[in-house]
């Protein structure tokens, strides 16, 4: 069993290395920024990311492209729930520095949890998406 788990871990590692999770990150950032825009946040605030949603994109245009590609990538993990969880964790880690404040972080986490379901995939049962140490946030 230990041998099988080791092989599973290796397979997951190589799957993660070949996955392009950027479209998922973009899709989620678009979602939470669109929500914020409707609450009066300045949609023209600058961003470090060359592919971060433009004010035009944030209104929904181009969003389906990120979602479609994101779902294709997550679909590759459908047979391995633990690996799917690791992919979600990686998305959370990659974006944590770009999330401004606790509220945005919680919102991103909430959208991230819903992502597999949004793609018509099974969501991992237990998946810890907490980035900083301290209280663990259970799936």
């Amino acid at each position: 069993r230990q041998q099988w788990e080791l092989q599973g871990d290796r397979r997951c590692q190589s799957q993660l290395e070949r996955a392009n999770l950027r479209p998922c990150e973009q899709h989620l950032m678009q979602k939470i920024q669109r929500d914020e825009d409707s609450y009066g946040r300045d949609p023209y605030s600058p961003s470090q990311d060359p592919y971060s949603p433009s004010p035009y994109d944030r209104r929904g245009a181009g969003s389906s492209q990120h979602q479609e590609r994101c779902c294709n990538e997550l679909n590759e993990f459908e047979n391995n729930q633990r690996c799917m969880c690791e992919a979600l964790q990686q998305i959370m880690e990659n974006q944590s520095d770009r999330l401004q404040g606790r509220q945005q972080e919680q919102q991103f986490k909430r959208e991230l949890r819903n992502l597999p379901q949004q793609c018509g995939l099974r969501a991992p049962q237990r998946c810890d998406l907490e980035v900083e140490s301290g209280g663990r946030d259970r799936y």
């Epitope: 070949r18 392009n20 950027r22 479209p23 990150e25 973009q26 990311d49 060359p50 592919y51 949603p53 433009s54 035009y56 994109d57 245009a61 181009g62 969003s63 389906s64 492209q65 990120h66 479609e68 590609r69 294709n72 679909n75 590759e76 459908e78």
Partner: antibody, heavy 123, light 108 residues
Framework: EVQLVESGGGLVKPGGSLRLSCAAS????????MNWVRQAPGKGLEWVSS????????YYADSVKGRFTISRDNAKNSLHLQMNSLRDADTAVYYC????????????????WGNGTTVIVSS | EIVLTQSPGTLSLSPGERATLSCRAS???????LVWYQQKPGQAPRLLIY???TRATGIPDRFSGSGSGTDFTLTISRLEPEDFAVYYC?????????FGQGTKLEIK
């Protein structure tokens, strides 16, 4: 050397079938999404079909949907396109292309192409 | 389906001149999913630009891509004899992954 070599093209009558193959070498085939793109004589490029690394997501152009089937065999480093109910309009050079992405920023692109195999549908 | 319309259909210029090729989408395309390819007669297409503005490995810096939303541009700052070819834009964000009809760049 990274290489894609298509084969299986030829002359076929309308309504007939043909199976194209693409042999990959010089890279880890199972790490990449793959595509078929075609070009009719004197015309532009037309995307035909794509398949993800583990064959879990497959797409087709409307013009071939229900007639063409894309598949891959990662153990044999090969990509296939089964073409049924062929029409005159399917006459083209068929290219096999590897899809990669920029690891740091995410954009996808087809960076390696075969030289193509010619399919002629004519009575 | 996202339709990409390239203009002009044919562009006649001399070596040393600047070429501006346009690609217009029927609906917004995220920069992440806009690609440019070059094709010479009897050859397979060659990747030029991806992500709307990033040059592929080995592509000279006289080639540049720009634009966003529905309007994208490929610019060749100073044409070299080997640049005369057909250029295609493609979107690969939404299936079907459509190509533009191409712009033929010919020697004047």
């Amino acid at each position: 050397e990274v290489q894609l070599v298509e084969s299986g093209g030829g002359l076929v009558k309308p309504g007939g079938s043909l199976r194209l193959s693409c042999a990959a070498s010089g890279f880890i085939f199972s790490d990449y999404n793959m595509n078929w793109v075609r070009q009719a004589p004197g015309k532009g490029l037309e995307w035909v079909s794509s398949i993800t690394r583990s064959s879990r997501t497959i797409y087709y152009a409307d013009s071939v949907k229900g007639r063409f089937t894309i598949s891959r065999d990662n153990a044999k480093n090969s990509l296939h396109l089964q073409m049924n109910s062929l029409r005159d309009a399917d006459t083209a050079v068929y290219y096999c292309a590897r899809e990669d992405f920029d690891v740091s920023t995410g954009p996808y692109y087809m960076d390696v192409w075969g030289n193509g195999t010619t399919v002629i549908v004519s009575s | 389906e996202i339709v990409l319309t390239q203009s002009p259909g044919t562009l006649s210029l001399s070596p040393g001149e600047r070429a501006t090729l346009s690609c217009r989408a029927s609906q917004s395309v995220s920069n992440m999913f806009l690609v440019w390819y070059q094709q010479k007669p009897g050859q397979a297409p060659r990747l030029l630009i991806y992500g709307a503005s990033t040059r592929a490995t080995g592509i000279p810096d006289r080639f540049s891509g720009s634009g966003s939303g529905t309007d994208f541009t490929l610019t060749i700052s100073r044409l070299e004899p080997e640049d005369f070819a057909v250029y295609y834009c493609q979107q690969n964000g939404n299936s079907p992954y459509t190509f533009g009809q191409g712009t033929k760049l010919e020697i004047k």
